[in-house]
Amino acid sequence: AVNGTSQFTCFYNSRANISCVWSQDGALQDTSCQVHAWPDRRRWNQTCELLPVSQASWACNLILGAPDSQKLTTVDIVTLRVLCREGVRWRVMAIQDFKPFENLRLMAPISLQVVHVETHRCNISWEISQASHYFERHLEFEARTLSPGHTWEEAPLLTLKQKQEWICLETLTPDTQYEFQVRVKPLQGEFTTWSPWSQPLAFRTKPAALGKDT
């Protein structure tokens, strides 16, 4: 649709994956489209097939190598093209000069675990996954705790303005079931955004000892 609105958004996970979403008003669901990636200073190029995720939206992942390999740097520019089949030919629909380290979205943190739990406190740790060594310590985290009777959207956000892969939750209620999530974001990049939330970690605080105020 020439006068319709389209959107082509891609993010680099800082290692070996570029995830892209292409949407276009009025586009047909069965349209066959691809994303082509052409780096300006690499010998490789890569293609992925856009698969429908909603009525007028398609997504795919450009797998650039082994998950922990450092395939791009801050000086790389990758020309990304959306090509859609029109009859017998492929038509270029969109082009973006993609600066990987300006468009970062890391993988969700993994390996969440309860390090220590008490009646009112819980210490939780996690790990970051497939994050570039270029960041060194220049990462921040957001965490949230789901309390009984509330939704995730209602949970207050706890901000960790440094690379700290643990948190001590306090003022919890004894003998209560909670869930915990965390996400990560590099400080670098004009269009950088938060990672997806981690898988929730369920934990229960210890019951208060009878006759004692803990």
Epitope: N3, G4, D40, T79
Partner: nanobody, 123 residues
Framework: QVQLVESGGGLVQAGGSLTLSCAAS????????VGWFRQAPGKEREFVAA????????LYADSVEGRFTISRDNAKNTVYLLMSSLKPEDTALYFC????????????????WGQGTQVTVSS
């Protein structure tokens, strides 16, 4: 904010050539890809060509492919549209527009617009 000013329009005979310029000023303009659109009297605005700043990748409308060439001069913050083998149906008001990240053929994908420059092709 980005400001765009087109120039170079005029009256030309069919088969002739003309070069339009789009000069830009404002915040980090070299990050914004640029497109040319045109609007003939009584018709809708239509896509002509577009270019990305960094790689110089280009996109053309089928009606002008092979006749028009879009280029850019990063040092001058200027985008050019070289129009050759002009036809009377190329007569229109030509606009340049800047997109935030991506060039497409859709005018709604462009955020900043110039005022336009008139091109008239006589037969």
């Amino acid at each position: 904010q980005v400001q765009l000013v087109e120039s170079g329009g005029g009256l030309v005979q069919a088969g002739g050539s003309l070069t339009l310029s789009c000069a830009a000023s404002g915040r980090a303009f070299s990050n914004y890809p640029v497109g040319w659109f045109r609007q003939a009297p009584g018709k809708e605005r239509e896509f002509v060509a577009a270019i990305t700043w960094l790689s110089g990748s280009t996109l053309y409308a089928d009606s002008v492919e092979g006749r028009f060439t879009i280029s850019r001069d990063n040092a001058k913050n200027t985008v050019y549209l070289l129009m050759s083998s002009l036809k009377p149906e190329d007569t229109a008001l030509y606009f340049c527009a800047a997109a935030l990240k991506t060039i497409t053929r859709g005018q709604n994908d462009y955020s900043y617009w110039g005022q336009g420059t008139q091109v008239t092709v006589s037969s």
